[in-house]
């Protein structure tokens, strides 16, 4: 009788089914929806998490101005196709044979087309800008304290290497977190910035993906940091391809 059998759950992903039938009675976990094996020592890929979510029952510091090529996820939830490693497939289609190309965080980066649409490669999102507005407080947060707390959060809770948190900007009440990670910078075992941003987004919404952990309790020098709005911008290594009609709409 092993420790794995006593506590066969996935600490980093509650949207899993686990059983102690791995080698030597080890706990083996698979993602809901896809049935794919999940590494419970790190974050699960956003693609597998979205698939699991769709299978579940329905329920003078200046701020950065997002580039003209920045994408916002306006399409909402969909049931994605994931590759054998759990990444988004470059082309996604719905049940009515409408297809589109996505980036590495699963956000649409082309106009929608039909089954003849080609998406030659999965384009990497190398820069993510998380734009938050916090609820009113007695005074502004100290910028360096805020910076340190958010960096600690991404390092400890999401296991994101500190070098990928490029900057934290603050102009009360707006906080911006910049994550940067080029293909060449990402080593084997590194958490992907897209996955970290998705876990953070779900935490902020009070929908934590972690098993049995309390919700996110963000505090700066003991003062609660409560977020009332979140916007996330995604910048790809290759700019998206939308028609002018969409851009002028």
């Amino acid at each position: 009788h092993t420790a794995a059998q006593d506590n066969c759950t996935c600490p980093t992903n509650k949207m899993t089914v686990c059983s102690p039938d791995g080698p030597g009675g080890r706990c083996q976990c698979r993602a809901l929806g896809s049935g794919m094996a999940v590494d419970c020592s790190t974050l699960t890929s956003k693609c597998l998490l979205l698939k699991a979510r769709m299978s579940a029952p329905k329920n003078a510091r200046t701020l950065v101005r997002p580039s003209e090529h920045a994408l916002v996820d306006n399409d909402g939830l969909y049931d994605p196709d994931c590759d054998p490693e759990g990444r988004f497939k470059a082309r996604q289609c719905n049940q009515t044979s409408v297809c589109w190309c996505v980036n590495s965080v699963g956000v649409r980066r082309t106009d929608k087309g039909d089954l003849s649409l080609r998406c030659d490669e999965l384009v990497r999102t190398h820069h993510i800008l998380i734009d938050l507005r916090h609820r009113p407080t007695a005074g502004a947060f100290n910028h360096s304290d805020l910076d340190a707390e958010l960096r600690r959060l991404f390092r400890e809770r999401y296991r994101l290497h500190p070098k990928f948190v490029a900057a934290v900007h603050y102009e009360q009440p707006t906080i911006q977190i910049e994550l940067r990670q080029n293909t060449s910078q990402k080593a084997a075992g590194d958490v992907d910035i897209g996955d970290a941003a998705y876990y953070f987004e779900r935490d902020i919404k009070g929908e934590s993906l972690f098993q049995g952990r309390g919700g996110l309790d963000l505090r700066v020098r003991g003062e609660p940091l409560q977020v009332e709005r979140t916007l996330i911008y995604y910048l790809d290594e290759i700019p998206p391809k939308f028609s002018m009609k969409r851009l002028t709409a």
Epitope: A3, G22, G24, R26, C27, A37, V38, D39, C40, A188
Partner: nanobody, 121 residues
Framework: QVQLQESGGGMVQVGGSLRLSCAAS????????MSWVRQAPGKGPEWVSY????????YYPDTVKGRFTISRDNAKNTLYLQMNSLKPEDTAVYRC??????????????WGQGTQVTVSS
């Protein structure tokens, strides 16, 4: 990138034997734990053997214990699965996988395309 290529599958009679091979590249094979995983039509994947990096530790589920033997040749970057006394229920696609074993958890993170094994009575 990680590549795993299986070979040696085929059709065999009940009670027969097969030896599967898996050629690995794109990662330090000699420091990686490995497994064989199978998937029968309409069923989920099931691990059938595990071997640690230096080959000193192996595990098998009860369904194949005593019939299957996993081994590896780190000099050749190759993983093997010797399957004896085959039964119809062993029919499946067999994939080799890079694996990770901790004190509490087991996971595979890369898989080959697989090789079909069919046991006919």
């Amino acid at each position: 990138q990680v590549q795993l290529q299986e070979s040696g599958g085929g059709m065999v009679q009940v009670g027969g034997s097969l030896r599967l091979s898996c050629a690995a590249s794109g990662f330090p094979f000699s420091s990686a734990d490995m497994s064989w995983v199978r998937q029968a039509p309409g069923k989920g994947p099931e691990w059938v053997s595990y071997i640690n990096a230096d080959g000193s530790k192996t595990y098998y589920p009860d369904t194949v214990k005593g019939r299957f033997t996993i081994s590896r040749d780190n000099a050749k970057n190759t993983l093997y699965l010797q399957m004896n006394s085959l039964k119809p229920e062993d029919t499946a696609v067999y994939r080799c996988a890079r694996a990770k074993l901790t004190d509490t958890h087991y996971v595979e993170d890369y898989w080959g395309q697989g090789t079909q094994v069919t046991v006919s009575s």
